[in-house]
């Protein structure tokens, strides 16, 4: 940055090089150029010469004043007009930053996605700080008192192998930057209570043309967790409101769920699961689309990449996995 230039004098900022956004600041420039009594001192911000709020303090020093400075980053440098010099002479430069102290991190959440081998901890960092803000995640065993700290700039993945102080821990997050430090409340966790089962996936759907047409959704998960509770939500694509069905599930075989749906309508399905009685849910699965037939039986399968006629009877179409605003990956 501009701080690496060779200086013939120096530049400094009051109250500091990193300051709270919206503050009034002063930038001082002091020349120390051989055989030069500066006629004039100039300030530049991001390469553009400043015209106003410059005060000459003495023969070698000038001050530039900004009211309500709101730019997150700026490169400042100053120059001198020396007698007998055709060009301005560079004095010095400095990068300045403005921002905010961190908010108290809240909504600290730690989960273990089955098979991942990691505990993933996230939190709400609060408002944007605009300046470099680091987070320290503290994990303290309730059994041994041993504490581990992890430095990060966002979320953290902690190998479950490194959690050797038993099953019960306290987790908290400390946020710090040049303008302040804050700390979250402590979250108490038990490793067995925060496991999220392996993702449930809808593989295909078929509508059986009976007296009352019936749609069967096939779905599965690779989870080894025995007691799993799941929710499947579905709606016509033209609707805003979801219908939700609940299931107690044993994934030793592919699940088949029956729905009695309106004919000739495009529906969308999603599924999510949790270990029964535990706190955290999987995010909702990708959107699975299925259009009910007017009269002809229909199968929808992810295996097909486009609409295909099968023996002239069954329509098969892809389930497009595009996420919508309804498909936020909430785990709470």
């Amino acid at each position: 940055g501009i701080t690496n230039i060779n200086c013939s004098g120096h530049i400094w900022v009051e109250p500091a090089t990193i300051f709270k956004m919206g503050m009034n600041i002063s930038i001082y420039c002091q020349a120390a150029i051989k055989n030069c009594q500066p006629r004039k001192l100039h300030f530049y911000k991001n390469g553009i010469k400043e015209r106003f709020q410059i005060t000459r303090i003495n023969k070698t020093t000038a001050r530039l004043w900004y009211k309500n400075f709101l730019e997150p980053h700026a490169s400042m440098y100053c120059t001198a007009e020396c007698p007998k010099h055709f060009q301005e002479t560079l004095i010095c430069g400095k990068d300045i930053s403005s921002g905010y102290p961190p908010d108290i991190p809240d909504e600290v959440t730690c989960v273990i996605y089955e098979y991942s081998g990691n505990m993933t901890c996230t939190w709400n960092a609060g408002k944007l700080t605009y300046i470099d803000t680091k987070y320290v995640v503290h994990v303290k065993s309730l059994e041994t008192e041993e504490e581990q700290q992890y430095l990060t700039s966002s979320y953290i993945n902690i190998s479950t192998d490194s959690l050797q102080g038993g099953k019960k821990y306290l987790v908290w997050v400390q946020a710090a930057n040049a303008l302040g430090m804050e700390e979250s409340k402590q979250l108490q966790i038990h490793l067995d209570d925060i496991v999220i089962p392996s993702a449930a996936v809808i593989s295909r759907a078929e509508t059986i043309n009976a007296t009352v047409p019936k749609t069967i959704i096939y779905w599965d998960s690779q989870t080894t967790i025995e007691k799993v509770s799941c929710e499947m939500r579905y709606k016509a694509t033209t609707n805003q409101t979801w219908n939700v069905k609940e299931f107690d599930t044993n994934f030793t075989y592919v699940q088949q769920s029956e729905f009695y749906l309106e004919p000739n309508i495009k529906y969308v399905f999603q599924v999510r699961c949790q270990e029964t009685g535990k706190r955290y849910w999987q995010p909702w699965s990708s959107l699975f689309f299925h259009k009910t037939p007017e009269t002809v039986p229909q199968v929808t399968s992810k295996a097909f990449q486009h609409d295909t006629w099968n023996s002239g009877l069954t329509v098969a179409s892809i389930s497009t996995g595009h996420l919508t605003s309804d498909n936020r990956g909430d785990i709470g």
């Epitope: 320290v136 503290h138 303290k140 309730l142 041994t144 008192e145 041993e146 504490e147 581990q148 700290q149 992890y150 430095l151 306290l170 908290w172 400390q174 430090m181 804050e182 700390e183 402590q186």
Partner: antibody, heavy 121, light 112 residues
């Protein structure tokens, strides 16, 4: 067995600074550990000053009253922790202890022998 | 977090039991330690994790409690137990507002 050996007694003038050292032996410097500093004014109780956490990164924590005046550092190459106290006043006359368990717990199995710092004009 | 210890002084007859109380201003789980500081010596750890006896400490010392209320008990006081006893919260020191992590101390004297 962890041993903590502190530097000798100091007499300082008000307004000056003091730096006390604490050499540790028996700590596994590849593991995470806390090294903390506690002081005790004559006839008074124990007063926590701050700690340094050494692990995959280094973090320091200070008592509210000590912020801006106390600096705790650690030199892993010499297994030595330091506590510097600036802007000394007569109330800072105390015995200064370093303390640790040699791990990342906050109770202290091991204490240094103490360093008496006297602040007097 | 503020640690409040009581009583301030505790005169006990040898062979009699003694009890010291420590209260935390907020939940510190079981993260509490007890120390004894004998005259002219550095403090020594007696109890950690509220109830675990440190190595080499006689089993007449015991600790109990969790959350905010904690107790140190000496089943039969001996002459060598004299000194000042301190409790210490060992939950977290990263909180920006901590002033002291130790209680004010309880001076135990042996009568007779």
């Amino acid at each position: 067995q962890v041993q903590l050996v502190q530097s000798g007694a100091e007499v300082k003038k008000p307004g000056s600074s003091v730096k006390v050292s604490c050499k540790a032996s028996g700590i596994d410097f590849n593991s995470n550990y806390y090294m903390c500093w506690v002081r005790q004014a004559p006839g008074q109780g124990l007063e926590w000053m701050g700690c340094i956490y050494v692990g995959s990164h280094v973090n320091t924590y200070y008592a509210n009253w000590a912020k801006g005046r106390v600096t705790i550092t650690a030199d892993e190459s010499t297994s030595t922790a330091y506590m510097e106290l600036s802007s000394l006043r007569s109330e800072d006359t105390a015995v200064y202890y370093c303390a640790t368990s040699g791990s990342s717990v906050l109770y202290f199995k091991f204490w240094g022998q103490g360093t008496l710092v006297t602040v007097s004009s | 977090i503020v640690m409040t210890q009581s009583p301030l002084s505790l005169p006990v007859t040898p062979g009699e039991p003694a009890s010291i109380s420590c209260q935390a201003s907020e939940n510190i789980y079981s993260f509490l330690a007890w120390y004894l500081q004998k005259p002219g010596q550095s403090p020594q750890l007696l109890i950690y994790s509220a109830s675990k006896l440190a190595a080499g400490v006689p089993d007449r010392f015991s600790g109990s409690g969790s959350g905010t209320d904690f107790t140190l008990k000496i089943s039969r006081v001996e002459a060598e137990d004299v000194g000042v006893y301190y409790c210490q919260q060992t939950n977290r020191y990263s909180n920006p507002d901590i002033y002291n992590v130790f209680g004010g101390g309880t001076k135990l004297t042996v009568l007779g």
